[in-house]
Interface confidence: medium
Amino acid sequence: PEPPTACREKQYLINSQCCSLCQPGQKLVSDCTEFTETECLPCGESEFLDTWNRETHCHQHKYCDPNLGLRVQQKGTSETDTICTCEEGWHCTSEACESCVLHRSCSPGFGVKQIATGVSDTICEPCPVGFFSNVSSAFEKCHPWTSCETKDLVVQQAGTNKTDVVCGPQDRLRA
């Protein structure tokens, strides 16, 4: 028979034949042959693999470093990574939760909707049209664009969500 060019789900092609992938929680020890099945071994104590795979090494569980304010939210298994969270009153800087802050800042283009409390982190909101924020801040709301008209000036440069409008003198040379 012709050697396969594609394999079924949970299989992989090697040496012109289809071998079974190792199940989550196990790593590859040796590929299958004409006569033997794929050989897999369970991951070690602090290791995991979360997919059907042909990896020869398991991944290390994430370390929740207490020096960074992290603690274990959910202990890892042979099939799942450890999930870290921050100590009480602190907040993760990203979804991956690799470090902690007392309260997060809102980036330029975003303003503070609600200042952080001991329980909840800063809540940011995008600056709508007519408002801007040019700073990274844990406190500042979006500021309204300057009104050139009230200063008897005209808009020379339009504002954005990160910059104020630029006002300039009115063109006196009018026919």
Epitope: N67, L68, G69, C86, E87, W90, T93, S99, C100, V101, L102, H103, R104, S105, V135, S136, S137, A138, F139, E140
Partner: nanobody
Framework: EVQLLESGGGLVQPGGSLRLSCAAS????????MQWVRRAPGKGLEWVSA????????YYADSVKGRFTISRDWSKNTLYLQMNSLRAEDTAVYYC?????????WGRGTLVTVSS
């Protein structure tokens, strides 16, 4: 390298005043929001006050509003916290911090003890 050095703490009687200073170096001082944070004995960290980069906007925790005043001096790259009407519950180590308050960076802080 960012360095923040707090000073001005000490022992003061209830109702007394203290002025804390924080000398900043290693970054452009005027670009950043600066903050004061404190840790009372055996307690977690508590945010106290913040000031915008331009110094025009100030923010305070409810527990210190009306008693503490934050300010900054760009010529000296220094942040201040004027503390009046001090209470026993203000006893803590006070830290200044730059913008985001990361868990892993703190100066030594300065100890404020309010006691009769």
């Amino acid at each position: 390298e960012v360095q923040l050095l707090e000073s001005g703490g000490g022992l003061v009687q209830p109702g007394g005043s203290l002025r804390l200073s924080c000398a900043a170096s290693g970054f452009t001082f005027g670009w950043y929001e600066m903050q004061w944070v404190r840790r009372a004995p055996g307690k977690g960290l508590e945010w106290v006050s913040a000031i915008s980069g331009d110094g025009y906007r100030t923010y305070y925790a409810d527990s210190v509003k009306g008693r503490f005043t934050i300010s900054r001096d760009w010529s000296k790259n220094t942040l201040y916290l004027q503390m009046n009407s001090l209470r026993a519950e203000d006893t803590a180590v006070y830290y200044c911090a730059k913008e985001l308050l990361y868990f892993d960076y703190w100066g030594r802080g300065t100890l404020v003890t309010v006691s009769s």
